[in-house]
Amino acid sequence: FNISGCSTKKLLWTYSTRSEEEFVLFCDLPEPQKSHFCHRNRLSPKQVPEHLPFMGSNDLSDVQWYQQPSNGDPLEDIRKSYPHIIQDKCTLHFLTPGVNNSGSYICRPKMIKSPYDVACCVKMILEVKPQTNASCEYSASHKQDLLLGSTGSISCPSLSCQSDAQSPAVTWYKNGKLLSVERSNRIVVDEVYDYHQGTYVCDYTQSDTVSSWTVRAVVQVRTIVGDTKLKPDILDPVEDTLEVELGKPLTISCKARFGFERVFNPVIKWYIKDSDLEWEVSVPEAKSIKSTLKDEIIERNIILEKVTQRDLRRKFVCFVQNSIGNTTQSVQLKEKRG
């Protein structure tokens, strides 16, 4: 197809050689077409499009991406030729940085359903350069963490060394959707919730005497829990005595709740106390039975093939530990009567 009618956008990706980072291109179809297509509509219902809207499907994956080879060869289908580039709905994700990503990328609807749709395409000229500005040593990371329940902020990596006063107007997107109220180089979050997690894109315009282009950076934001200040607690056994039948097999379960730690080295073990002696028991591997953002619940069982008279004189102790401290719970076996 003829790409001369495509609208054109120039983008710059300046990547840090120190960190892994991703990049995205949105299929920014001209506004009226986009309203029926990529659901990135910014028209109010009262605004009438200047020409007929694109009559395409509402299926968000219904766009086709191509790369235009610099030697003038025919357009190449992205999906077939570039394994490090992923199409997700209307967005093209670049998984690895590198100057070899520089080039012209074209997107258009797969289904052309009206004569107006022929020019329904966008050509994005992407220039990729390694960051050379050594004066900005502490630029914001492309992976930023927000602590749940606290105040936080998301900084635009390409502008993080500039003061708010110097900063140009920034356009922010979250998971591909425009955040229309955010215009500064930093998004301030008054209280962090899970839903603040996602892929943020910040764009600003840079110009010289000849042309202007969009400088874009992508930030992966994670919401995290602060490291626990508590030692683990034992959820089971609760009682310190357990009624048993002599000669029968017995399994005693120890379940403990460990709070989140970035460096997580939980200890959960059983040992036996018999008068003055104490020894650790070889028991089956510990296993996590529940995993949430805040807690990991880990279980470890002690298995007795046959309860003996001697076992009634012993104490079975579950010991759990994290970096903060340890907790124990002991169980004394008692013979069931009658």
Epitope: V225, F260, F264, N265, P266, V267, I268, E285, A286, K287, S288, I289, K290, S291, T292, L293, K294, D295, E296, I298
Partner: nanobody, 115 residues
């Protein structure tokens, strides 16, 4: 730190079999859910199969009856036995362990099904 190392990928003809292994280190307990994911060129990563600490399993519809996930707790290893492979199974296969509901990934192993 959690480390996951996949192996066993390679080139195989349609109808053939492969067995992928994922060795976990830096974990002192059996993870709640271990999974195999795959990513074909130009496509998002998708779940292939997962196994819980209680050994219950879950499979993507496209691999049911052909793939089997299992774990060797003594060796902290999870396996994916892939039979009757098809060209559409071609992808990079990744091992995944969820701890504190967060994903930990291996580097991946390439599986190519082609005649």
């Amino acid at each position: 730190d959690v480390q996951l190392q996949e192996s066993g990928g390679g080139l195989v003809q349609p109808g053939g079999s492969l067995r992928l292994s994922c060795a976990a280190s830096g974990i002192s307990f059996r993870v709640n859910v271990l999974g195999w994911y795959r990513q074909a060129p130009g496509k998002p990563r998708e779940l292939v199969a997962s196994i819980s600490s209680g050994d219950s399993t879950n499979y993507a519809d496209s691999v049911k009856g052909r793939f089997t996930i299992s774990r060797d707790n003594a060796k902290s290893t999870v396996y994916l036995q892939m039979n009757n492979l098809k060209p559409e199974d071609t992808a990079v296969y990744y091992c995944n362990a969820r701890i504190f509901a967060r994903d930990n990934w291996g580097q991946g192993t390439q599986v190519t099904v082609s005649s």
